[in-house]
Interface confidence: medium
């Protein structure tokens, strides 16, 4: 009887051992699967995140394009209205010019002496930019970046003068410290009679012959309203 019990016990141990091994194998399998699922989930998550990011970027880009399209459409619509009307009023900015606070600005990408830049603007029925406020200064600075750029301010005939007649004495000024200094030490003959934006946006007087970039400005007519979109 004892030997029979021992036989049964051995059988049970064997069965239990098989069961344990089988269970362990299943657990191992499940944990591997779980790992795979986890990895798969992580991969899906990152894919989803990337798609979301791409979608968000596409959306931003599309918004920019739509904004630009609306702006172009408004500009073209205005140009057409101007061409259909008597045309003596400037109701919108010419193509390639930037509108800001009822003025149009054009930013050169090449260099000219001050007088040539002044002439260039006048040949566009405009003038070199006249800065009348800190707000306008920031706007221009944003567009020109850290590059020496002529403005419509000079003292070639004595006192400092804005090209459009804006009063210099009572107006906005943003000179660099110690400027204007009418420096003669450059060896180019004469002093410095023309004002320009420096790399930090503040103003300096320099030799008018230097080939700096420039900004043209023309004012939109006061009474004009933005035309409706077509």
């Amino acid at each position: 009887q004892n030997s029979q019990l021992q036989e049964e016990l051995r059988g049970l141990r064997e069965t239990f051992s098989n069961f344990t091994a089988s269970t362990e194998a299943q657990v191992k399998g499940l944990s591997t699967q779980g790992g795979n699922v986890g990895r798969k989930m992580k991969s899906l998550e990152s894919q989803l995140e990337k798609q979301q990011k791409d979608l968000s970027e596409d959306h931003s880009s599309l918004l920019l394009h739509v904004k630009q399209f609306v702006s172009d459409l408004r500009s073209l619509s205005c140009q057409m209205a101007a061409l259909q009307g008597n045309g003596s009023e400037r109701t919108c900015c010419p193509v390639n010019w930037v509108e800001h606070e009822r003025s149009c600005y054009w930013f050169s990408r090449s260099g000219k002496a001050w007088a040539d830049a002044d002439n260039y603007c006048r040949l566009e029925d405009a003038h070199l930019v006249v800065v009348t406020s800190w707000e306008e200064q920031k706007f221009v600075q944003h567009h020109i970046g850290p590059v020496n750029t002529w403005m419509g301010l000079h003292d070639q005939n004595g006192p400092w003068k804005w090209v459009d007649g804006t009063d210099y004495e009572t107006g906005f000024k943003n000179w660099r410290p110690e400027q204007p200094d009418d420096w003669y030490g450059h060896g180019l003959g004469g002093g410095e009679d023309c004002a320009h934006f420096t790399d930090d946006g503040r103003w300096n007087d320099d030799v008018c012959q230097r080939p700096y970039r420039w900004v043209c400005e023309t004012e939109l007519d006061k009474a004009s309203q933005e035309p409706p979109l077509l």
């Epitope: 101007a82 061409l83 259909q84 009307g85 008597n86 045309g87 003596s88 400037r90 010419p94 193509v95 390639n96 010019w97 054009w106 090449s110 000219k112 040539d116 002439n119 260039y120 006048r122 040949l123 566009e124 029925d125 043209c216």
Partner: antibody
Framework: EVQLVQSGAEVKKPGSSVKVSCKAS????????INWVRQAPGQGLEWMGE????????FYAQKFQGRVTITADKSTSTAYMELSSLRSEDTAVYYC???????????????WGQGTTVTVSS | DIQMTQSPSSLSASVGDRVTITCRIS??????LAWYQQKPGKAPKLLIY???NLAEGVPSRFSGSGSGTDFTLTISSLQPEDFATYYC?????????FGQGTKLEIK
């Protein structure tokens, strides 16, 4: 259709003045600059000056400064070029030309008048 | 003032030839140059603006190249109606000077 139609031929005495007209049609007159260019017999083209009818701003070549006056009449869409103290060397065909409106890029003369012959002879 | 040197002043060529006219400028004018064609007794006609752009209605055998101080007008295959005088003109500030002209004649 854009057109620039100039006045007829003129014969003038030395020392006198001539006034040539250029009537524009087919576009908004005040939206473009009008330029004047002359060509002496068998010679090349010579730029004389420009007017912006919108603002009446004018620009003249140094050579003609003080002798040439360019004006514009918005009501009739007509530009005028008057040249005074005429001499025989002023005998030429005088053209008006519209300056193409490519703001902030390059300019060009896209439409020209048919030309006006001015003969200066005693 | 800006000086314009156009060359050659005259040239003889045959129908079908490729012809090149050059315009050299005394200073950098970037792309501010136009080319015109003029036939006897007629007003000049715009061919090329901004150095490389073909004006409306101008055949594609005409092309412009260059920027800065050296510019070229090329006619790829001469047609009988192309025999005329050609002028370059700069627009880099006044005066808007023209080149001296190139007379293109039949060989």
């Amino acid at each position: 259709e854009v057109q620039l139609v100039q006045s007829g031929a003129e014969v003038k005495k030395p020392g006198s003045s001539v006034k040539v007209s250029c009537k524009a049609s087919g576009y908004t007159f005040t939206a473009y600059g009008i330029n004047w260019v002359r060509q002496a017999p068998g010679q090349g083209l010579e730029w004389m000056g420009e007017i912006f009818p919108r603002s009446d701003s004018t620009f003249y070549a140094q050579k003609f400064q003080g002798r040439v006056t360019i004006t514009a009449d918005k009501s009739t869409s007509t530009a005028y070029m008057e040249l005074s103290s005429l001499r025989s060397e002023d005998t030429a065909v005088y053209y008006c030309a519209r300056k193409g409106r490519e703001y902030g890029t390059s300019h060009y003369f896209d439409y020209w008048g048919q030309g006006t012959t001015v003969t200066v002879s005693s | 003032d800006i000086q314009m040197t156009q060359s050659p002043s005259s040239l003889s060529a045959s129908v079908g030839d490729r012809v090149t006219i050059t315009c050299r400028i005394s200073e950098n004018i970037y792309s501010n140059l136009a080319w015109y064609q003029q036939k006897p007794g007629k007003a000049p006609k715009l061919l090329i603006y901004a150095a490389i752009n073909l004006a409306e209605g101008v055949p594609s055998r005409f092309s412009g190249s260059g920027s800065g101080t050296d510019f070229t007008l090329t006619i790829s295959s001469l047609q009988p109606e192309d025999f005329a005088t050609y002028y370059c003109q700069h627009f880099w500030g006044t005066p808007f000077t023209f080149g001296q002209g190139t007379k293109l004649e039949i060989k």
